[in-house]
Interface confidence: medium
């Protein structure tokens, strides 16, 4: 399908102008490449009327142009001076008339209506409110006032100043006549439907003295605004319907083949399954605007949506509607990255998060997506640091790789964690997207130690336990603070090729702490990851606490060097705001062996990659 | 509409203190990272401090020890301490709320005039 895209459907009447927006994914060549608007023939072909390289045809001559807005990916063709004869099926297209790359426009140039002399013309869309201005002579004053509807040669009684209104106009319109010396009254239709359209005449007073008016009321379905955005993008439907309308159910639908709209999301808590985890209403503001944002775009999800307001929370005839006319674009600028990541209970995940490679130095965020009401994302972390604290020691949101992705880790994985997280920037809003995390069975690939008390003063040793398959991934561990996760120092240990035969005894990464100081309290990750690719982490608390009297201390090696498929997943955990953390004060006191003898080297904290029958409590 | 009203703003010689208030309407002042920027005369617009929903602050190096922010989220209120005031912190403060990239708000604008 053709990535190409513009109005369907164009009307307009003699003697006015048009201004017809084509789209176009704004690639270098795209941008650069010849636009043209062409007019279809009986043969098939299409005649260029109007190019981006300067040429009008006769027919446009002084009357039309075309221009290109390559920032934008747009182009807009003018004409002016329409003519009956303008009606007929055209093209926006780029590069070669014949290619392929453009959009069918439908232009159609009606005869404007034959209306009597002096008569008003009112233009309102559908649902707003008209106020017809009356006027009347003196001697009208005290008599009858009256609003009719002509259909046909025939004059239908709308509403009069004796209180007669008639039922297709029930609760939505009123006559107002003014204080004495004012000679005009007025009448107010509320809610317009689009069978209102047509011609009324006022009357005041009655025989060949009584005073008349013309009106006619044109009522128009809003015009769709043209939405343009990538697949896998974000869209936002910023929708103001007015104040008479502020405290009403709101709504976005889309309408359907049947011309009806589905209800995609309303104030009243419904939503469409097929946006779950991608999509919000945004709160309205005290005028009763608000706004939609829908992520993850799709090409199923093109169409045209309406937006208005209705107690039912859902489209009815006469209340105010806004339109948009949505296209994905499916050469999209937003790579793919997996929409949906699966973790393990007591595991981790890496999401990958694209944005606008343009903005490297945006503000980066992850939130959770939560359904109740119209939707909510609190944020759980931003690029300068986490935001909730019940995400303590678990959660960290890293700028690697860069040029266009960033990365989220969330370990200590339980089920409550499963849900839709949106990926944002404060930059580029059309590069928002969603990544649903989903809980399967299985076990973590990396194991450390439930929690360990260390020492002050003491060296500390974790092992961190990996199966064969990460054997040619990098390992690291770092220390878990609210900015981010600072790498430790590793050591070489043995030739480099310490994991190519991945036999049992060649599976841990272990970190040493020599001396444990006060500062070495907290959360140490051990992870695996190549390049700038982050894999599966493990975290483990780390207390310290003063050395006790000589003989009162425990050590327990076997929790310390845990066989490589042990399971040595922690169990206190704690609810708080509905998700499942770790909390290092609920832990069974446990400790890791410690090695009070000094550390050869000198560097306090290493990263140990060796052997578990080599594993020792000091570094070699 | 959405508002964002700064208050607080005035003359102060070199070595004071000021404190500049922001009030925000509560749906947008619950959900976002709400911070403060400045524009010194004949500058670009940057970055001071920021407090994110959770209570994260961040602060510009130049002003890191010296100014303060805090928010108080039952009157919807963001607060800007600034002490130990320099001629180079001259500039009009804006208010900022972000709402995670949803929305971006911004005040009119607060003039802090740092001179002796």
């Known amino acids: 399908k053709s990535p190409v895209f513009g109005p369907q459907e164009v009307s307009s009447v003699e003697g006015n102008s048009v201004s017809i927006k084509c789209y176009y994914p704004p690639t270098s060549v795209n941008r650069h490449t010849r636009k043209y608007w062409c007019r279809k023939g009986a043969s098939g072909r299409c005649i260029t009327l109007v190019s981006s390289e300067g040429y009008v045809s006769s027919n446009y001559a002084g009357r039309a142009n075309l221009t290109n807005f390559p920032e934008n990916g747009t182009f807009v063709v003018n004409i002016a001076q329409l003519s009956r004869d303008d009606s007929g099926h055209y093209k926006c297209g780029l590069g070669i008339n014949s290619r392929g790359l453009s959009f069918d426009v439908s232009l159609e140039v009606s005869q404007g209506p034959e209306l009597p002399n002096g008569t008003e013309v009112y233009t309102v869309d559908v649902g707003r409110t008209v106020t017809i201005k009356c006027p009347f002579k003196t001697e009208n004053a005290p008599k009858t006032k009256a609003l009719y509807k002509k259909i046909g040669q025939t004059s239908v009684l709308v509403i009069d100043s004796r209180n007669y209104v008639n039922p297709n106009y029930k609760d939505r319109i009123r006559l107002r006549i003014p204080g004495t010396g004012q000679l005009i009254f007025t009448v107010v239709i509320d809610r317009l439907r689009l069978s209102d359209h047509g011609l009324y005449l006022c009357q005041a007073g009655d025989g060949s003295n009584r005073d008349e008016k013309n009106a006619d009321l044109q009522v128009l379905e809003p015009e769709p605004e043209l939405v343009y955005e990538d697949l896998r993008g974000s869209v936002t439907f910023h929708c103001a319907l007015g104040l008479e309308v502020a405290n009403v159910a709101k709504f976005l639908c889309r309408v359907n083949s049947r011309e009806t709209c589905d209800v995609v999301i309303n104030t009243l808590g419904k939503r469409d399954s097929a946006f779950e985890g991608r999509i919000l209403l945004n709160p309205q503001d005290k005028d009763g605007s608000f706004s939609v944002v829908i992520t993850g775009l799709r090409k199923e999800d093109e169409g045209r949506y309406l937006c208005g307001a209705h107690s039912d929370g859902q489209l009815q005839e006469g209340w105010p509607i806004q339109a948009w006319q949505l296209f994905v674009n499916e050469e999209s600028t937003i790579p793919r990255s997996p929409t949906v990541v699966k973790g393990v209970a007591g595991g981790s995940v890496a999401v990958l998060c694209p944005y606008n490679p343009k903005e490297s130095q945006s503000l980066k965020y992850w939130c959770l997506w939560e359904g109740a009401q119209n939707g909510r994302c609190p944020l759980l972390v931003e690029s300068q640091g986490l935001v909730q604290e019940q995400y303590e020691g678990r959660l960290s949101l890293l700028q690697e790789p860069g040029n266009g992705t960033f990365t989220v880790i969330l370990n200590q994985l339980t089920t409550q964690d499963a849900g839709f997280y949106w990926c944002l920037t404060n930059g580029d809003t059309r590069w928002r997207t969603t990544v649903e995390i989903k809980i399967i069975e299985g076990e973590p690939n990396l194991k450390v130690p439930g929690n360990v008390t260390a020492v002050l003063g003491e060296t500390l040793n974790i092992p961190c336990h990996f199966p064969c398959k990460f054997s040619s991934y990098e390992k690291y561990w770092c220390k878990w603070s609210n900015t981010g996760c600072q790498t430790l120092p590793s050591q070489d240990e043995g030739p480099s090729e310490a994991f190519v035969n991945c036999d049992e005894n060649s599976r841990l990464v272990s970190l040493t702490l020599n001396p444990v100081t006060r500062a070495d309290e907290g959360w140490y990750w051990c992870g695996v990851k190549q390049g700038h690719f982050y894999g599966e982490t493990a975290a483990v608390y780390v207390a310290v606490e003063e050395k006790k009297v000589a003989g009162s201390r425990y050590v327990s090696p076997a929790k310390a060097d845990a066989a490589p498929d042990e399971k040595v997943l922690d169990s206190g955990v704690r609810e708080i705001e509905n998700k499942a953390i770790q909390d290092p004060r609920l832990f069974a006191e446990e400790k890791v062996v410690a090695d009070t003898g000094d550390q050869a080297g000198g560097s306090r904290a290493s990263v140990d990659s060796s052997s578990s029958e080599e594993q020792g409590g000091s570094s070699k | 509409q959405v508002q964002l009203v700064e208050s607080g703003g005035g003359l102060v010689q070199p070595g004071g203190s000021l404190r500049l208030s922001c009030a925000a309407s509560?749906?947008?002042?619950?959900?976002?990272?709400m911070g403060w920027y400045r524009q010194g005369p004949g500058k670009q617009r940057e970055f001071v401090a920021r407090?994110?929903?959770?209570?994260?602050?961040h602060y510009a190096d130049s002003v890191k020890g010296r100014f303060t922010i805090s928010k108080d989220n039952a009157k919807n209120t963001v607060t800007l301490q600034m002490n130990s005031l320099k001629p180079e912190d001259t500039a009009v403060y804006y208010c900022?709320?972000?709402?995670?990239?949803?929305?971006?708000?911004w005040g009119q604008g607060t003039l802090v005039t740092v001179s002796s």
């Open positions: 900022n709320a972000d709402r995670f990239g949803f929305e971006v708000y």
């Open positions: 407090i994110s929903p959770g209570g994260v602050t």
């Open positions: 509560g749906s947008i002042f619950s959900a976002s990272v």
